[in-house]
């Protein structure tokens, strides 16, 4: 008779990540009885969301549930229906929702109460929704990439998880760059954090960590596209603008409405002698790189030194991992460049011939891609430069300590992962003790 | 002020389905969401779902079982329940609020409640 | 779903006393985001509907006396009635509206010694 094979021993969990552009599922695996160790748990499944933000729906909240079906179907089919009572579903929506509750609380609450109706319907152990904050989600960022890396981790490795880390403990730092905001944190070398409200204390694994965290609402590249374009607008002298973050020959309208719904182009709006414009691309990086930089105040600051906007940033400090939109758009360009590493220098001379192209040659250059994101990398890729050098202060040197990093042995590198760990107390404060060979199973 | 009116009694055979009506009136009906519990004779309260916004969600004891409805045009909410059985003999109330978003008060405004009998 | 336990099941109280009745949750109500507990204690006289006394696990509903108040946190709640009324005989009963399915706990019946 054939042998039978013990029925695993493991635990799943689901967080759903509720961007301000789209929502993803996640679902994560791990030993039942390791669940304290480090690098144990991994992901199993990502299942995008089909449509915008769950902030998009505040209008017809009735569609929510339709919206969330696929994939929570998905989970159902992925977990053993044995486990389907005790996986938690966390889902957490971050920096859309937060503008949305800028707007209007009511609507806000309206739409995570039909959120928590529609995910309250499946048989898993579902624990509510809610919007993070943005130093939650820089946190939960930085923790994700640090546990996927082994930093945690006091036992010494002799294998490399990815082809750049470095073997010693030091932390990455985690740079995360979404549709409506952007956060950067990381560990500064013995410097006192001088903003309160940008420090953060863990103990983890059995040390201490003094952990400087900013997100920046308004930031992140959908918005502050926004941001552009409505302090672009009031210099135009028609209804045409042209602008040089888009390839020549590229056209489109847009409605002054869209334009002002946004809280972020609150500070630039004004009375328009027309209700729709249309852009119309000239393809400058230089000229689209000068207006990005308008959008980041660095006149003031009450600090030893600042990011921008007033916002205390130390020096930088280490190696740090850049995902999420950092990622999508430079994985792009590195494409592009044909799979060579780039250094900053190269990465702004291509920028330089990528924006003059013409627009109808990018399309036919690039036509399994879709027009929508294709039409806004030179925007996206400007930004992300802008941001990291003049923003965050990067240079050509630091430039080098940048890790554009998508997945890290298998898993997504966001916040979602940190976000469970915490919430199923995963993360012990000392570092656990084990047996001699109680790692002998895996690695 | 809003106000609730549940429908009247029923006296129901086992196996058969009976559905209660709650209106509002006096207030936005489509504010908050409307909430079902019960109560068996000398027992405690029981959540059996609710539903806002157009989403209806229910305890998974009833699930498969209840139906709950609402028609914001009459400002009306309804519950279903079929394959009444003996145990299902109860009160059943209708109440505004419940959820932790959009009802974040608590159940603040309760209707009368409707008495129905499963007996054979 | 989260169990809520109330004690004691029945309490007799003279007239002008304390009365305090407890409810704890299996999980926190707690919510992080605004530090509200999502609890409701609800008086349920015979006949009736029952009646919002205190939501948010503290803050007493419209039109409640005084003499209701509501304190805990995270788990543990307490509802109290610093001065018992003869209106007061009742049956109260706590619920969280922090997750679905919405749970009550199983009540305290409240009489005059």
């Known amino acids: 008779t054939q042998n039978k094979a013990l029925p695993e021993n493991v635990k799943y969990g689901i967080v759903l990540d509720a961007g301000s552009s789209h929502t993803s599922l996640y679902i994560y695996k791990w030993p039942a009885e390791k669940e304290n160790d480090t690098g144990v748990v991994h992901q199993v499944e990502e299942c995008r969301v089909k449509g915008p933000g769950i902030s998009k729906f505040v209008q017809k909240v009735n569609e929510i549930g339709i919206y969330l079906t696929d994939c929570m179907e998905r989970a159902r089919e992925v977990i053993p229906r044995s486990q389907h009572q005790e996986t938690p579903v966390y889902l957490g929506a971050t920096a859309g929702m937060r503008l949305l509750r800028m707007e209007s609380e009511e609507l806000a609450d309206r739409v995570l109460d039909v959120v928590e109706r529609s995910l309250s319907n499946y048989p898993f152990d579902f624990q509510g929704a809610r919007i993070i904050t943005g130093q939650e989600e820089g946190a939960y960022g930085w923790i994700t990439i640090n546990y996927l890396l082994g930093k945690f981790s006091q036992k010494t490795r002799w294998f490399s998880i990815v082809p750049y880390e470095t073997n010693n403990q030091e932390t990455f730092g985690a740079l995360d760059l979404g549709g409506a905001s952007t956060q950067v944190t990381f560990v500064p070398q013995n410097q006192t954090i001088e903003s309160p409200d940008n420090a953060l204390q863990f103990r983890l694994y059995g040390k201490d960590y003094n952990v400087y965290t900013h997100s920046f609402l308004c930031y992140g590249k959908d918005q502050a596209l926004w941001q552009k374009l409505a302090k672009d607008i009031q210099v135009a002298s028609n209804e045409i603008l042209r602008d040089p973050c888009f390839h020549p020959g590229y056209k489109k309208v847009v409605n002054v409405s869209d334009l002002y719904k946004t809280p972020c182009t609150k500070r630039f709006e004004m009375t328009l002698p027309f209700q729709q414009f249309e852009i119309q691309g000239i393809g400058n990086y230089q000229q689209c790189h000068q207006s990005i930089l308008e959008l980041f105040n660095t006149s003031y600051c009450p600090y030893s030194q600042c990011a921008f906007n007033g916002i205390f940033l130390p020096p930088l400090q280490g190696d740090f991992g850049a995902f999420s939109a950092f990622y999508f758009v430079m994985d792009f360009f590195k494409k592009v460049a044909k799979n060579s590493v780039i250094s900053q220098e190269k990465v702004t001379e291509m920028m330089k011939k990528f924006c003059a192209q013409p627009w109808e040659e990018i399309k036919t250059s690039y036509a399994g891609v879709k027009e929508k994101y294709l039409s806004e990398y030179c925007f996206s890729g400007t930004y992300i430069l802008s941001l990291l050098l003049q923003g965050y202060h990067f240079t050509a040197d630091s430039w080098e300590h940048i890790h554009f990093i998508g997945k890290i042995q298998g898993s997504d590198a966001g916040w979602t992962l940190g976000y469970m760990l915490n919430l199923t107390n995963m993360i012990p404060a000392e570092q656990p003790l084990s047996t001699p060979l109680s790692h002998s199973t895996y690695v | 002020q809003v106000q609730l009116v549940q429908s009247g009694a029923e006296v129901k055979k086992p196996g058969s389905s009976v559905k209660v009506s709650c209106k509002a009136s006096?207030?936005?009906?489509?504010?908050?969401?409307i909430s079902w519990v019960r109560q068996a004779p000398g027992q405690g309260l029981e959540w059996m779902g609710g539903i806002g916004f157009g989403t209806a969600n229910y305890a998974q004891k009833f699930q498969g079982r209840v139906t709950i409805t609402a028609d914001e045009s009459t400002s009306t909410a309804y519950m279903e329940l079929s394959s009444l059985r003996s145990e299902d003999t109860a009160v059943y109330y209708c109440?505004?609020?419940?959820?932790?978003?959009?009802?974040?008060?608590?159940?603040?405004?309760w209707g009368q409640g409707t008495t129905v009998t499963v007996s054979s | 779903g989260i169990v809520m336990t109330q004690s004691p099941d029945s309490l007799a109280v003279s007239l002008g006393e304390r009365a305090t009745i407890n409810c704890k949750s299996s999980?926190?109500?707690?919510?992080?985001?605004?530090?509200?507990?999502?609890l409701a204690w609800y008086q349920q006289k015979p006949g009736q509907p029952p009646k919002l006394l205190i939501y948010?696990?503290?803050t007493r509903a419209s039109g409640v006396p005084d003499r209701f108040s509501g304190s805990g946190s995270g788990t543990d709640f307490t509802l109290t009635i610093s001065s018992l009324q003869a209106e007061d005989v009742a049956v109260y009963y706590c619920?969280?509206?922090?997750?679905?399915?919405?749970?009550f706990g199983g009540g305290t019946k409240v009489e005059i010694k």
């Open positions: 948010w696990a503290s």
């Open positions: 006096g207030g936005t009906f489509s504010s908050l969401p």
């Open positions: 109440a505004r609020g419940g959820a932790k978003y959009a009802g974040r008060y608590g159940m603040d405004v």
């Open positions: 999980q926190s109500v707690l919510f992080s985001s605004n530090n509200k507990n999502y």
């Open positions: 619920q969280q509206y922090y997750l679905y399915p919405l749970t």
